[in-house]
Interface confidence: low
């Protein structure tokens, strides 16, 4: 379970055609579900339920987008329509070029993630906790255009991270 | 407006140095990304590198044609991008733009008119 | 690095549509940008993130981006729309900017 760098910068503009570009950086794993690769993307945040419907016409990002999901408490979805893997693989089938699950509140999930598919997905599904959960959904959350680069080895240079 | 004004382009002998600047005005120079492109006369595009705003800890990154020779800085109190250019070789005659990023410094809105560096013996 | 290449003239008539290509390695997976370069005068971003029209940019712009192909086009081509014109990618992989070759657009007449 090696860790995922991920590296996140949020872009809000003005009317006036002013902008500006924040980056914020966390850790998580990448999980035996999905391969150790590198990914970029466009985040979308995508709601667990949203990931339970089977209209592939629906729905449909252009590729190359990094789905972001908070998982809930198990007892808040006693009867899940998808495992964790199953949410995932739905992702990637959906252009996803990688996964970002929030586990903080279903810790249960990493052991899901991490039983040795046969088949793991050949995009890397991350998962994250704690604070650095809380920096990802608090970007996320704001609803601005937000880009996310996973990397497996530290940022080539060092960038200076600060919280949102 | 908008507006990127290029300065310092001229003649250098090969292996010689020169430093670019480019002035900002018409908006918040400080939380921009940053970045040089250029043109050989006759050719195409060229991005040189780049430099991030504070909040992205002025990173910088650069073409692997010019790294170690050229540094990107920046001075956000004078609104001012530099281009400094060591060890120059004659492959580097150009026309040097300075340009503002967008959307994680994919793409390119703001360009200034350029500033001709020759490199010749 | 993803290598972009564009052809190096296009030509058209007024009025008729120009479609400038871009091709590269699974270049749908990436975004690409166009710009417009008249001599003499430096680049304009005509459109951004394959389909996307910056203020300013006539409607007879347009881009698509799918499989190992961006291709810009414009409808109705004006005199005023020959230039130079290049597209532009981000090679995240590699954290470098790329941009083609440039194709001439000859407006005929």
């Known amino acids: 379970k090696e860790t995922a760098f991920v590296e996140v910068v949020l872009f809000e503009s003005s009317p006036s055609g002013d902008y500006t570009t924040y980056t914020t950086g966390l850790t998580g794993r990448f999980s035996r579900a999905g391969a150790t690769l590198s990914a970029e993307g466009e985040i979308v945040q995508m709601h667990p339920l949203g990931l339970c419907n089977n209209n592939d016409e629906e729905d449909l990002y252009e590729y190359g987008w990094v789905g972001v999901v908070k998982l809930e408490q198990p007892e808040l979805d006693p009867k899940p329509c998808l495992t964790v893997l199953g949410k995932a693989k739905r992702a990637v089938q959906r252009g996803a070029t990688a996964v970002i699950f929030d586990v903080s509140e279903n810790p249960e999930a990493i052991d899901q993630l991490n039983q040795g598919s046969e088949d793991p997905l050949k995009r890397p599904v991350v998962y994250v906790k704690g604070a650095d959960a809380i920096k990802l959904m608090n970007i996320v959350n704001k609803q601005k255009v937000a880009r996310a680069r996973i990397q497996h080895r530290p940022p080539r240079q060092p960038t200076e991270y600060f919280d949102m | 407006e908008v507006q990127l004004v290029e300065s310092g382009g001229g003649l250098v002998k090969p292996g010689g140095s020169l430093r670019l600047s480019c002035a900002a005005s018409g908006f918040t120079f400080s939380n921009a990304w940053m970045s040089w492109v250029r043109q050989a006369p006759g050719k195409g595009l060229e991005w040189v590198g780049f430099?991030?705003?504070?909040?992205?800890?002025?990173?910088?990154e650069y073409a692997a044609s010019v790294k170690g020779r050229f540094t990107i800085s920046r001075d956000d109190s004078k609104n001012t991008l530099y281009l400094q250019m060591n060890s120059l070789k004659t492959e580097d005659t150009a026309v040097y733009y300075c340009a503002r990023a967008i959307y994680y410094l994919e793409a390119f809105d703001v360009w200034g008119q350029g500033t001709l560096v020759t490199v010749s013996s | 690095d993803i290598e972009l290449t564009q052809p190096p003239s296009v030509s058209v008539s007024p009025g008729q549509t120009a479609s400038i290509t871009c091709s590269g390695d699974s270049l749908g997976s990436y975004y690409v940008h166009w710009y417009q370069q008249k001599p003499g005068q430096a680049p304009v971003l005509v459109i951004y993130r394959n389909k996307q029209r910056p203020s300013g940019i006539p409607e007879r712009f347009s881009g698509s981006n799918s499989g190992n192909t961006a291709t810009l086009t414009i409808s109705g081509t004006q005199a005023e729309d020959e230039a130079d014109y290049y597209c532009?990618?981000?090679?995240?992989?590699?954290?470098?900017?790329?941009f083609g070759g440039g194709t001439k657009l000859t407006v005929l007449g």
């Open positions: 532009q990618t981000y090679d995240w992989m590699y954290s470098s900017r790329v």
């Open positions: 430099t991030k705003n504070e909040v992205g800890g002025y990173t910088t």
